[in-house]
């Protein structure tokens, strides 16, 4: 399995998505586990509802939640109030009997909030009405993108509050592609700050 890297800011929420074939994994419960060492076991953190028809109900274990869109084929894990100790290797799993299939290997990286210890400088960000709770950096395993762009909303309004920034952020980071993320909130399109940085992190 390749490894997908999701990057989040300490103190914020990080949302991890694991797509899967909904027919292949039909009727199966899912789980999120933490890899203990390179060859060690994967320790269960949280699993979906015991009743498969209730899989899309959000289940919590501490600060970690899981919910499964069984029709769309997407398992979503939310790590609330991300902390440095949350960094590490995880797996999304599909359960059948005592067996578990790996849907995706995930490397969680935790960034410090740079505004806690440095000036935001001349950066302009969406104002008070915008929410960054679900913002995350997803490092995909696809080839690096040829160009990068910033959503137009990033240059339109002054910084209304201390919104978190990745520590490596600068106006036009090389190889950084900012994609538009669908969100149920009322943010304008392009302002949801879902960064997709294309870099190869294969761990065959």
């Amino acid at each position: 399995h390749n490894t997908t890297v999701f990057q989040g800011v300490a103190g914020q929420s990080l949302q991890v998505s694991c797509p899967y074939d909904s027919m292949k994994h039909w009727g199966r419960r899912k789980a999120w586990c933490r890899q203990l060492g390179e060859k060690g076991p994967c320790q269960r953190v949280v699993s979906t509802h015991n009743l498969w028809l209730l899989s899309f109900l959000r289940r919590w274990n501490g600060s970690t939640a899981i919910t499964d869109d069984t029709l769309g084929g997407t398992l979503t894990i939310t790590l609330r109030n991300l902390q440095p100790h949350d960094a590490g290797l995880y797996q999304c799993q599909s359960l059948h009997g005592s067996e578990a299939d790996t849907l995706r290997k995930v490397l969680v990286e935790v960034l410090a909030d740079p505004l806690d210890h440095r000036d935001a400088g001349d950066l302009w960000f969406p104002g008070e009405s915008e929410s960054f709770e679900d913002a995350h950096v997803e490092h995909s395993i696809s080839r690096p993108s040829q160009g990068s762009h910033l959503p137009s909303c990033l240059s339109k309004e002054p910084l209304g509050r201390r919104n978190p920034l990745p520590t490596h952020f600068h106006p036009s980071p090389p190889g950084l592609h900012l994609s538009h993320q669908d969100s149920s909130s009322q943010r304008p399109l392009g302002c949801s700050l879902a960064w997709t940085e294309a870099r190869d992190t294969s761990t065959q």
């Epitope: 909904s22 209730l54 919590w60 029709l71």
Partner: antibody, heavy 128, light 107 residues
Framework: QVQLQQSGPGLVKPSQTLSLTCAIS??????????WNWIRQSPSRGLEWLGH?????????EYAVSVKSRITINPDTSKNQFSLQLNSVTPEDTAVYYC??????????????????WGQGTLVTVSS | DIQMTQSPSSLSASVGDRVTITCRAS??????LNWYQQKPGKAPKLLIY???NLQSGVPSRFSGSGSGTDFTLTISSLQPEDFATYYC?????????FGQGTKVEIK
């Protein structure tokens, strides 16, 4: 509005099969946003969830551990209804049986599941 | 299975009284709890879902609170039509279970 109408015999002999039907109006048994449940109530056991069925690309059913080996819930899409079959009944299975719709709450997001519409109930007595 | 224990099993109250019914789960169920009202010869009726959310059409005098193992249903000002039996129900476990009921009678 959504309504559930139950039908079936009120008297079943021990060791035989209890069969009830629940006809749905105002919703579809094939809805992917609902589950269709059977629940029973007796003085000795109180309210007891028996199982449910739901359509998620294919039909899927799940049953309470206490009746798992004896129960079947089936859909009938042509009549927009679902049925309960409980095998090898004993006097302990004497109860009022209800069908109910299971729905998912939108507040809080992805956290609510409840029985919002119920059938009128059918008293089933198991006796020879 | 998760056991749901309601208290009291019955209570007597007058119209206008504030009534509180509690429900305790044998293990933590987060907010996975519903409240129903049942009148004699009728099916249960949903009042509160996910511990604290009022079902559409239910009077605002009904409210629910709690999380984990301890939950409360409160009727702020009891009305004549509220004399009934009330049940809690959890949906955390693979076998959803109900409390044994609390009967609210006229004093």
């Amino acid at each position: 509005q959504v309504q559930l109408q139950q039908s079936g015999p009120g008297l079943v002999k021990p060791s035989q099969t209890l069969s009830l039907t629940c006809a749905i109006s105002g919703d579809s048994v094939s809805s992917s946003s609902a589950a269709w449940n059977w629940i029973r109530q007796s003085p000795s056991r109180g309210l007891e969830w028996l199982g449910h069925i739901g359509y998620r690309s294919k039909w899927y059913n799940e049953y309470a551990v206490s009746v798992k080996s004896r129960i079947t819930i089936n859909p009938d899409t042509s009549k927009n209804q679902f049925s309960l079959q409980l095998n090898s009944v004993t006097p302990e299975d004497t109860a009022v049986y209800y069908c109910a719709r299971g729905m998912y709450g939108s507040v809080p997001y992805k956290e609510g599941y409840y029985f919002d519409i119920w059938g009128q109930g059918t008293l089933v007595t198991v006796s020879s | 299975d998760i056991q749901m224990t309601q208290s009291p099993s019955s209570l007597s109250a007058s119209v206008g009284d504030r009534v509180t019914i509690t429900c305790r789960a044998s293990q933590g169920i987060s907010s996975d709890l519903n409240w129903y009202q049942q009148k004699p010869g009728k099916a249960p009726k949903l009042l509160i879902y996910a511990a604290s959310n009022l079902q559409s059409g239910v009077p605002s005098r009904f409210s629910g609170s709690g999380s984990g193992t301890d939950f409360t249903l409160t009727i702020s000002s009891l009305q004549p039509e509220d004399f009934a039996t009330y049940y809690c129900q959890q949906y955390t476990d693979e076998s959803m279970t109900f409390g044994q009921g609390t009967k609210v009678e006229i004093k």
